[in-house]
C-alpha cells in the first residue's frame, strides 16, 4: 500500500515518463504510419483526462519499414499504460460534457505527438499547482 505522497510522487514520475516516451517516438516520426489521428488541443478545464484517453486510444502505428520497429512498438504500448481509474475518474467531474475523441482535429504523427506532450505538460503543471495549494482534486 502506497502512502498518499508516495503515490503522488509515483504518479508524477509516470506522467514525466510518458513525456520521455513521446520524445523518443518523435525521433522515429518517419517510421510511423502517416495516418491522421485525433489530437486534442487547448483542452478545456476538467476535460484533461478525457483528452488523455483520446490520445491513448489513437491508432499510432509503426510503419514496419526498418530497424526501429521494436523500440517504436514498445514505446507505443507503454504510452497506452492505463492510469488507475481513481486518477482519471475522480478528477473528471465533467467528463460527460467533454468533446468526443472524434470531434478533435486530426493531425499527422508529428503534430499528434507534440500535442500529446503539450497536454501531459499541462497536466503535470496542474498536478503540481494543486499540491502546492493543498488541494486533493488535482
Amino acid at each position: 500500500h502506497k502512502s498518499s505522497s508516495q503515490g503522488q510522487d509515483r504518479h508524477m514520475i509516470r506522467m514525466r515518463q510518458l513525456i520521455d516516451i513521446v520524445d523518443q517516438l518523435k525521433n522515429y516520426v518517419n517510421d510511423l504510419v502517416p495516418e491522421f489521428l485525433p489530437a486534442p488541443e487547448d483542452v478545456e478545464t476538467n476535460c484533461e483526462w478525457s483528452a488523455f484517453s483520446c490520445f491513448q486510444k489513437a491508432q499510432l502505428k509503426s510503419a514496419n519499414t526498418g530497424n526501429n520497429e521494436r523500440i517504436i512498438n514498445v514505446s507505443i504500448k507503454k504510452l497506452k499504460r492505463k492510469p488507475p481509474s481513481t486518477n482519471a475518474g475522480r478528477r473528471q467531474k465533467h467528463r460527460l460534457t467533454c468533446p468526443s475523441c472524434d470531434s478533435y482535429e486530426k493531425k499527422p504523427p508529428k503534430e499528434f505527438l507534440e500535442r500529446f506532450k503539450s497536454l501531459l505538460q499541462k497536466m503535470i503543471h496542474q498536478h503540481l499547482s494543486s499540491r502546492t495549494h493543498g488541494s486533493e482534486d488535482s
Epitope: 503515490g7 509515483r10 515518463q17 520521455d20 523518443q24
Partner: antibody, heavy 126, light 106 residues
C-alpha cells in the same frame, strides 16, 4: 528477497533443442516484463528476447528469430526460452533479467533490467 | 537499428582516480532510454544507472551518469578496488548494448 534462478543449460549438438527455465521469487512476477540476455565466452552482452508482463507481446533479436521462443507461466512464476535448431554461435551463458518498468502505474519505473539471475551455460558442440 | 559505441575499449587507472566512460549512439536517444550496467568476472551484470542519470537502488553516489541526444557519459568519481569491471551502456526498448568498456587496474 527478489531472485531469479535459471536452469536447463547443458551441452547439446548443433541442430538440437534445449529449453531454459527461470524461476522468479520475491516479487509479483505477473507485473513485470522479462528478458533473456546472453554472453558468449569472452564477449559482451547480447539481448536475446523480451516478453510483456502478460505475455501479450514478444520481441526477438534477429540472430535468434524463428529459432527461439520466449514464453512465461505467471501461475508458476516461471519464464522459459525454447531454443531450436541450435548453432555453435549460440554457445553462451544465458541470463534471465527482469524489466524494471512495472505494469503497475504506482510500481517500479526503471527503464532498464534491474534484477538478473546467475546465468546458465549452454554449449553447442558436436 | 541503433548502434551504441563505447570508448575507450579499456581504461587503465589506479584506485582513487576518476573514470570517465563514453557511450555514443548512432541516433538520438531520449534520456529515459539510456542505462548503464556493471559486470564483474564470473558474475551477472548489475543495473547502475537508468534514465541516463538516475542511480539504481543501492548504487553508491560515486557513480554518476549524464548526457543527452547521442552522447552519454558514466563517471566514477573515485575508483574503489571493487569498481574494476566491465561497463555496458544500453538503449532501452531496442535493448541494444554497447560493446563494453573494461576498467582495469593500472
Amino acid at each position: 528477497q527478489v531472485q531469479l534462478v535459471e536452469s536447463g543449460g547443458g551441452v547439446v549438438q548443433p541442430g538440437r533443442s534445449l529449453r531454459l527455465s527461470c524461476a522468479a521469487s520475491g516479487f509479483t512476477f505477473s507485473s513485470y516484463g522479462m528478458h533473456w540476455v546472453r554472453q558468449a565466452p569472452g564477449k559482451g552482452l547480447e539481448w536475446v528476447a523480451f516478453i510483456w508482463y502478460d505475455g501479450s507481446d514478444k520481441y526477438y533479436a534477429d540472430s535468434v528469430k524463428g529459432r527461439f521462443t520466449i514464453s512465461r507461466d505467471n501461475s508458476k512464476n516461471t519464464l522459459y526460452l525454447q531454443m531450436n535448431s541450435l548453432r555453435a554461435e549460440d554457445t553462451a551463458v544465458y541470463y534471465c533479467a527482469r524489466d524494471g518498468d512495472s505494469s503497475d502505474w504506482y510500481g517500479d519505473y526503471y527503464f532498464g533490467m534491474d534484477v538478473w539471475g546467475q546465468g546458465t551455460t549452454v554449449t553447442v558442440s558436436s | 537499428e541503433i548502434v551504441l559505441t563505447q570508448s575507450p575499449g579499456t581504461l587503465s587507472l589506479s584506485p582513487g582516480e576518476r573514470a570517465t566512460l563514453s557511450c555514443r549512439a548512432s541516433q538520438s536517444v531520449s534520456s529515459s532510454y539510456l542505462a548503464w550496467y556493471q559486470q564483474k568476472p564470473g558474475q551477472a551484470p548489475r543495473l547502475l544507472i537508468y534514465g541516463a542519470s538516475s542511480r539504481a537502488s543501492g548504487i553508491p553516489d560515486r557513480f554518476s551518469g549524464s548526457g543527452s541526444g547521442t552522447d552519454f557519459t558514466l563517471t566514477i568519481s573515485r575508483l574503489e578496488p571493487e569498481d574494476f569491471a566491465v561497463y555496458y551502456c544500453q538503449q532501452y526498448g531496442s535493448w541494444t548494448f554497447g560493446q563494453g568498456t573494461k576498467v582495469e587496474i593500472k
